[in-house]
Interface confidence: medium
């Protein structure tokens, strides 16, 4: 920031200058001296503070003009002022020049000053209120003691009849829209009029012009008009100087999220410009800068309390819908059904969207990330979710082809973790990818870049390409441990399934039948004995367990987990023609987590003493922890289409109480 400037004196004449409080004016008395001058003395008015600086040493001038200094090339004056002027050019510094011993000056130079206060102010201390001239406003630091203002991307839609998010145009239609914006105040104080030839300008850089927008409310008392003054094609705005003490309130909106090549930081500047002569550019004599960080999009892990559960209504899922409704009624959240006119036959609501939120000290709201998958549910987020205080963001690849890995069953987030002393208070994003060197499917780069650029939930890439569908929610889930801040990682495990089945076989239940009561499937009489004796199935699942273990090791390393933090849920997979895995029976790990209530795919496992041994086993693992297991029949409406409960539902959750700006990424 420009905090010092030089003013050139001229003997025999008066020089006028505008001084901005908090800055230094330097002036060279030596160069301005008349011939024959050897010494100089100084006089100044009471609100002016003058120092004689020689060789970097400053001496305060506390005089009535009696003292004299030697004229020397290394002698300069440093001038500051303590308060704004009430009239233009009313404060002065007079330099009298003398020959060696003379008591009468041989000439003099005058500096006539107009002191004004200019401060561009924001909520740099992050308490929700704009403070005055915070010294840290021009920098941005993370952590509980961090400083720097925060900006929300204005990605909601306050006005229902408009097709897009508020940040997509340069208009403000309501006061509500201003509440999403961060306030910025330009404070000025000074005489009624500035001397001729000065101008105050707000401006942004070209590189920030597509990232930030600034509005000014004209006529705050009658028929407000919201004027767009900065952003997009508008790089600067001349501010009318009104004199006296003035505060101009501006509203600042973010236009885009942090991303590849954009850290999230934007700067806004105010400059006092001086006019020299016609056809000569205005020169800045003072600049004040504020920095905003655009709030990142934050995902919400399973351990956070649910607010709404979303599910699609299909021709064939009436019973499933009913069971989900019953589960939701046990919790204190609401069920939101996406009907057929909107889902158009697409049941995979988990894959279409990911719920998250954005937050600033003054405001926060949920924001849905729309996947590039764009199935028949593609209109749902814009038509049903985008609205007042509900934002929308999407990332679409330009050239890459979209694969199943771009669906958001392949996008999860862990609870808060600490890894080797480094804390991730908002958890870490988990995405599925291909095995290193395999050249397989990978989530599209634009989405990966977007997720990484948010900085607060550093992503971890897992290996999910071994699955037919290829989503991380097919082999892992997190559950809270009720009454504690701890959580458990649930992992699908083929070895746990074989171990359980062998135990049951050993106990004499080898002929226990799977898929009982399911018509065609139960007529095949799939028993424990048949499964254990199917050598190719055994081999396939040994391979699949290696894939699971690869992910287990990554998760332990990257989330700082131990074996005690992981519970294995029995699962079996069948290899498809591309040598990828699909669930043999409903995959229990693909569950919906609503606080302590778990909606688990009903596995239709072998019936031992009229009970499903898989359900019994899972209850035995989870219910002692205080979790309640509800098994939901998804076999005909979801499982047979290669998905389960989690794939067919979505949950909007409460945001973290932890403030993202308190972390250090």
């Amino acid at each position: 920031m420009l905090r010092e400037r030089t003013v050139r004196l001229q003997y025999g004449s008066r020089v006028e200058a505008v001084y901005v409080l908090g800055t230094y004016l330097w002036t060279d008395v030596y160069s301005a001296a008349p011939a024959g001058a050897q010494t100089f003395s100084l006089k100044h008015s009471e609100h002016v503070w003058v120092e004689v600086v020689r060789d970097g040493e400053a001496e305060e001038v506390a005089t009535n003009g009696k003292q004299r200094w030697l004229l020397s090339p290394s002698t300069t004056l440093r001038v500051t002022m303590s308060q704004a002027s009430t009239e233009a050019s009313s404060d002065k510094v007079t330099v009298n020049y003398y020959d060696e011993e003379g008591s009468i000056p041989i000439d003099q130079a005058g500096l006539f000053l107009t002191a004004i206060e200019i401060s561009l102010d924001v909520d740099a201390d992050r308490d929700g209120v704009v403070e005055k001239n915070n010294p840290k406003k021009a920098s941005w630091t993370w952590g509980p003691e961090g400083q720097g203002a925060i900006l929300l991307v204005n990605c909601d839609r306050e006005t229902p009849w408009l097709p897009k998010e508020d940040c997509r145009d340069e208009k403000v239609y309501s006061k509500e829209d201003l509440k999403d914006m961060s306030q910025m105040i330009l404070r000025t104080k000074g005489p009624d009029r500035l001397p001729a030839g000065y101008e105050i300008v707000l401006y942004i850089s070209m590189s920030d012009s597509d990232k930030v927008g600034v509005f000014y409310v004209e006529n705050p008392f009658f028929g407000q008009r919201y004027i767009h003054i900065l952003g997009r094609r508008k790089l600067y705005h001349v501010v009318k100087y009104t004199g006296g003490s003035a505060e101009l309130l501006f509203f600042v909106e973010g236009l885009c999220f942090p991303d590849e090549g954009f850290s999230g930081l934007v700067s806004i500047h105010v400059s006092l410009l001086e006019y020299m002569a016609q056809d000569i550019p205005l020169t800045p004599i003072f600049t004040d800068t504020v920095i905003f960080r655009i709030a990142p999009w934050i995902m919400t892990p399973n351990i956070l309390p649910p607010v709404s559960v979303f599910v699609c209504c299909m021709k064939d899922n009436y019973l499933f819908l009913k069971e989900v409704k019953n589960l939701v009624e046990k919790t204190n959240c609401e069920l939101k059904v996406c009907f057929q006119y909107l889902n158009r036959g697409d049941r995979w609501i988990q894959d279409e969207i990911e719920f998250g939120y954005i937050e600033a000290p003054h405001k926060g709201f949920p924001v849905v990330l729309d996947s590039p998958r764009d199935g028949n549910l593609k209109d749902f987020p814009v038509k049903e979710l985008l609205g007042p205080d509900f934002g929308y963001v999407t990332r679409e690849p330009l050239f890459e082809s979209v694969t199943s890995l771009d669906s958001f069953g392949n996008l999860e987030v862990s609870p808060p973790v600490t890894v080797n002393g480094k804390t991730y208070p908002l958890g870490r994003i988990l995405i599925g990818s291909s095995f290193p060197l395999s050249g397989g499917r990978r989530m599209t780069k634009v989405v990966r870049d977007f997720l990484k650029a948010q900085q607060v939930q550093a992503p971890v890439e897992l290996y999910s390409d071994w699955l037919t569908v290829g989503h991380v929610d097919e082999f892992m889930s997190f559950v809270p441990i009720p009454g504690t801040k701890k959580f458990l990682l649930l992992m699908a495990s083929t070895s746990a399934c074989y171990k359980l089945f062998r135990e049951k076989q050993k106990d004499g239940h080898g002929e226990a039948i799977m898929f009982k009561g399911l018509g065609g499937m139960s007529s095949k009489r799939i028993t424990i004995n048949k499964i254990l004796s199917n050598e190719s199935l055994v081999q396939e699942n040994l391979y699949f367990q290696r894939c699971l273990d690869w992910n287990r090791d990554i998760l332990k390393k990257e989330l700082g987990l131990t074996e005690q933090d992981i519970i294995d849920l029995p699962a079996l997979f069948k290899m498809d023609e591309d040598h990828r895995a699909r669930a043999f029976f409903p995959n229990m790990v693909n569950m919906i987590v609503l606080d302590k209530d778990l909606g688990i795919p009903k596995p239709f496992g072998p019936q031992v003493e009229e009970e499903c041994c898989l359900e019994m086993h899972v209850r035995g693992l989870l219910e002692p922890l205080g979790l309640e297991c509800t098994f939901i029949d998804d076999i005909s409406a979801y499982h047979k289409f290669l998905g389960e409960v989690h794939c067919g539902t979505n949950v909007r959750r409460k945001p973290f109480t932890f403030k993202w700006w308190h972390m250090v990424p």
């Epitope: 050897q38 040493e57 005089t63 009696k66 090339p73």
Partner: antibody, heavy 118, light 107 residues
Framework: EVQLQQSGPDLVKPGASVKISCKAS????????MHWVKQSHGESLEWIGR????????SYNQKFKGKAILTVHKSSNTAYMELRSLTSEDSAVYFC???????????WGQGTSVTVSS | DIVMTQSQKFMSTSVGDRVSVTCKAS??????VAWYQQKPGQSPKALIY???YRYSGVPDRFTGSGSGTDFTLTVTNVQSEDLAEYFC?????????FGSGTKLEIK
């Protein structure tokens, strides 16, 4: 760091002369006057005069006119004071001092003791 | 010549006390007064200029005040290292003159 290094003590006979040097370092020599001050044993301080290092122009306390001659050598950043026709009254410690606020003396040399004795 | 009178040759004080050294000019010198501290066997050290402005590095327990003809150097919370002689000086007009000095003794 500003330093004023004076020459060592002198024992001189009555009627003789002595020239004391004061070498300045750590600042722009021509930007400050150099002052000279006398302190007789157990007495107060007396201002002798000052010299402008730019042009060698000097001003004296009337009492020391003809007794002290102040000069400078710009290229070596050194000021000199010559004391003439010495008597026992001239036995004292002599200080050079940089005139910060013109006559307020911000930095002092370590002093040079002059003893006049036969 | 302007005469600077420091009427007290000696002043006795204790560590932690507050002491005021006074100096009187024979005519009005406005605020063109400096104060110096001289410890035995050392050169004088500048403390105050323009009656009330501390030189950089001078502890804030040293305060100068006054204008016209009456000037005071006040030392609050006296420390043992403040044992020294204190001189005032006027530089309003030639020749510049010093007071006769006041010796501060620690009880």
């Amino acid at each position: 760091e500003v330093q004023l290094q004076q020459s060592g003590p002198d024992l001189v006979k009555p009627g003789a002369s002595v020239k004391i040097s004061c070498k300045a370092s750590g600042y722009s020599f021509t930007a400050y006057y150099m002052h000279w001050v006398k302190q007789s044993h157990g007495e107060s301080l007396e201002w002798i005069g000052r010299v402008n290092p730019n042009n060698g122009g000097s001003s004296y306390n009337q009492k020391f006119k003809g007794k002290a001659i102040l000069t400078v050598h710009k290229s070596s950043n050194t000021a000199y004071m010559e004391l003439r026709s010495l008597t026992s009254e001239d036995s004292a410690v002599y200080f050079c001092a940089r005139g910060d606020y013109l006559p307020s003396l911000g930095y002092w040399g370590q002093g040079t003791s002059v003893t006049v004795s036969s | 010549d302007i005469v600077m009178t420091q009427s007290q040759k000696f002043m006795s004080t204790s560590v932690g006390d507050r002491v005021s050294v006074t100096c009187k000019a024979s005519q009005n010198v406005d605020t063109t007064v400096a104060w110096y501290q001289q410890k035995p066997g050392q050169s004088p050290k500048a403390l105050i200029y323009s009656a009330s402005y501390r030189y950089s590095g001078v502890p804030d327990r040293f305060t100068g005040s006054g204008s016209g003809t009456d000037f005071t150097l006040t030392v609050t919370n006296v420390q043992s290292e403040d044992l020294a002689e204190y001189f005032c000086q006027q530089y309003d007009s030639y020749p510049f003159t010093f007071g006769s000095g006041t010796k501060l003794e620690i009880k």
